[in-house]
Structure formats: structure tokens, C-alpha cells
Interface confidence: low
């Protein structure tokens, strides 16, 4: 397994609708045709997988139907969007990139993006 550099923003603030987007960029040492991107969440020293997608270079990034993530790829950049976030989901979101094919296998893990989620204030009931 060979190491690879992955860059991602340090901080992102989720929108009032609970949507956070960030770019994950990797320094590809070779001409990979198959790439796997995994988003990990680290909170209270526990790491959990948020979502993952495998894609062929030049094709769209397809997450599973049950995933809260969507994304697009452009060259060595992956634009990730995480939806449905609430305040309790605030944490460090780490981008992990694997160059699956052809060999050799490369693995890169970013330093993480701290996503802050603030639950919107409830709107007062309206008479009209």
C-alpha cells in the first residue's frame, strides 16, 4: 500500500437546511481508472463511515441509494455534499481516497473537514 496526499478544507459550515459541501482533492501518482472515495466521521475519538462511492475516472460519482451523500468528480477533485445534517452531526469529516485499479494500490487520508451544523430556530406558528 502506497501513501498519497489528500487535501480538504479545514472548516465548513452547513447550511440552515443541513447541507454541507466540500472539495476533496488527491494527488494521483499514476493514471488510476477506478477510484473509491469514503467519507468518515470522527467524533469523541470514534470513527464511523458516513458514505462511500466507487467510480471510474471520467464518469459520475455514484453513491448508494441509502446514502446521505452525493458527489461529482472532476479530474483529481471530488465535490462532496452531505445532506440531512443536524447539530448532533457536528464533527470532523475525513476524506479517504483509494486508487483501486490498476495496481499499485494507493491510499490517501485527508486531515478532515470540521463541519459545524446549527439547527435552525423553529418558526413561530403563523395565523396566515
Amino acid at each position: 500500500c502506497k501513501a498519497m496526499h489528500v487535501a480538504q478544507p479545514a472548516v465548513v459550515l452547513a447550511s440552515s437546511r443541513g447541507i454541507a459541501s466540500f472539495v476533496c482533492e488527491y494527488a494521483s501518482p499514476g493514471k488510476a481508472t477506478e477510484v473509491r472515495v469514503t467519507v468518515l466521521r470522527q467524533a469523541d475519538s470514534q470513527v464511523t463511515e458516513v458514505c462511500a462511492a466507487t467510480y471510474m475516472m471520467g464518469n459520475e460519482l455514484t453513491f448508494l441509494d441509502d446514502s446521505i451523500c452525493t458527489g461529482t468528480s472532476s479530474g483529481n477533485q471530488v465535490n462532496l455534499t452531505i445532506q440531512g445534517l443536524r447539530a448532533m452531526d457536528t464533527g470532523l469529516y475525513i476524506c479517504k481516497v483509494e486508487l483501486m485499479y490498476p495496481p499499485p494500490y494507493y491510499l490517501g487520508i485527508g486531515n478532515g473537514t470540521q463541519i459545524y451544523v446549527i439547527d435552525p430556530e423553529p418558526c413561530p406558528d403563523s395565523d396566515f
Epitope: 464511523t48 463511515e49 462511500a52 467510480y55 471510474m56 448508494l64 441509494d65 441509502d66 446521505i68
Partner: antibody
Framework: QVQLVQSGAELKKPGASVKVSCKAS????????MDWVRQAPGQGLEWIGN????????SYNQKFKGRVTITVDKSTSTAYMELRSLRSDDTAVYYC?????????????WGQGTLVTVSS | EIVLTQSPATLSLSPGERATMSCSAS?????MHWFQQKPGKAPKLLIY???ILASGVPARFSGSGSGTDYTLTISRLEPEDFATYYC?????????FGQGTKLEIK
């Protein structure tokens, strides 16, 4: 109505390859992923991998990595699953099954299955 | 890989009785999907997204659960319900199925 029709049973020797076809009809072929699942005799279900017929991007179960290739022929709305370096424990019924999307049911449609027997 | 463990492996009941089977995931999943399979036949989608009945599935079937623990319930068994039931997760690759619960006539 949606139909997935698979190719017939195959008898193969260890080390050989098999290519199973799955012809789809009754829907727009490129709108849904096609998955492949297998079931060894008396055993449970095991996911092999899938393909997006539009982009032809694939995802495979790492267990089969390097031995399996899933392809499509968009002109005939047919998906193919090729498994190489066959072993006796690859003896199973192989199913193609149509994926869904966020607003649809997943794996609601299945082919009739193709029995692949690996024996010397 | 998310491992799904179904229990019990075999459930022996009589028609008219209530059947409850479980599916436990090794890590949290978003939804659970359930399939019914009869000998020599392809699996049939029963419930998707934890609790949504697939087209044509009778209302005696229901699904529930969240996180790592999910349940399939058949409120009143009919003779045609005796089959093997599989749970499946689509939260992360590889997609995985449980080993199955065989529902047999007592």
C-alpha cells in the same frame, strides 16, 4: 412489464470462465443499475457487483475482485457477468436483478437465474 | 463489510400464528430491506426502506427497526408464507445479505 431473461445453464471445468447474459425489457435500460447476486446450493445470497448501464461504471464485491467483469450492451439492453478462474465453490445460481433509485423499490425485479456448475 | 446476522435460523410455527424474525447489523445501517425466497425460485422483494411494502405484498407483513436492529413481522401466517427470509443492507459496499431465516410449518 419489466422482464429480465437470463441465458441457460452452464457446465464448466475448474479454471475456465463463464459469461452469463441478462436481457432487460419493459423499461429504459440505462435508467437503472443492474446488479448480480449468486446463491450456492443450500446457501444464502451473495452480492457480486453492479453496473450503471449509462456510464458503464461498476462496483464489485472485493471477494471477486480481479475475477469478475460486469459489462453491458446498450444496443440490446443486455447485461453480462463474466467470472474467470472458476473453482468448484463457484457452483451456484447466478441472478441479475434490477436496482432502483431513491423513489423506487430496489431489487424488485429478478432474472430467472442461471445455474453454473463447476466440475472436473 | 457490514455483517447481517439473522435470528432465529429456523422458525417453526403453525398457520394463523404470528411470526417475528430479527436482523442485526454489525454497524449502523440507514435502512433494511427484506426478501422472501421459495425453493427453486428467485428471491422476491417483500419490504424495502425498513417498512415500505413492495407492490402486491399483503398487509400482514410489516418491518421495523433502526440503527443496527431490525425486525420482520408476519401478523397471521398463511400457508404460502412458509419460505426463507433474507435481510439486506445497501448502506455501504459490498451490499450484504443475512444468512436467512427459514420459516417452516410446525
Amino acid at each position: 412489464q419489466v422482464q429480465l431473461v437470463q441465458s441457460g445453464a452452464e457446465l464448466k471445468k475448474p479454471g475456465a470462465s463463464v459469461k452469463v447474459s441478462c436481457k432487460a425489457s419493459g423499461y429504459t435500460f440505462t435508467d437503472y443499475n443492474m446488479d448480480w447476486v449468486r446463491q450456492a446450493p443450500g446457501q444464502g445470497l451473495e452480492w457480486i457487483g453492479n453496473i450503471n448501464p449509462n456510464s458503464e461504471s461498476t462496483s464489485y464485491n472485493q471477494k471477486f475482485k480481479g475475477r469478475v467483469t460486469i459489462t453491458v450492451d446498450k444496443s440490446t439492453s443486455t447485461a453480462y457477468m463474466e467470472l474467470r478462474s472458476l473453482r468448484s465453490d463457484d457452483t451456484a445460481v447466478y441472478y441479475c436483478t434490477r436496482d432502483g433509485n431513491r423513489y423506487d423499490a430496489w431489487f424488485a425485479y429478478w432474472g430467472q437465474g442461471t445455474l453454473v456448475t463447476v466440475s472436473s | 463489510e457490514i455483517v447481517l446476522t439473522q435470528s432465529p435460523a429456523t422458525l417453526s410455527l403453525s398457520p394463523g400464528e404470528r411470526a417475528t424474525m430479527s436482523c442485526s447489523a454489525s454497524s449502523s445501517v440507514t435502512y433494511m430491506h427484506w426478501f422472501q425466497q421459495k425453493p427453486g425460485k428467485a428471491p422476491k422483494l417483500l419490504i424495502y426502506s425498513t417498512s415500505i411494502l413492495a407492490s402486491g405484498v399483503p398487509a400482514r407483513f410489516s418491518g421495523s427497526g433502526s440503527g443496527t436492529d431490525y425486525t420482520l413481522t408476519i401478523s397471521r401466517l398463511e400457508p404460502e408464507d412458509f419460505a426463507t427470509y433474507y435481510c439486506q443492507q445497501r448502506t455501504s459496499y459490498p451490499l450484504t445479505f443475512g444468512q436467512g431465516t427459514k420459516l417452516e410449518i410446525k
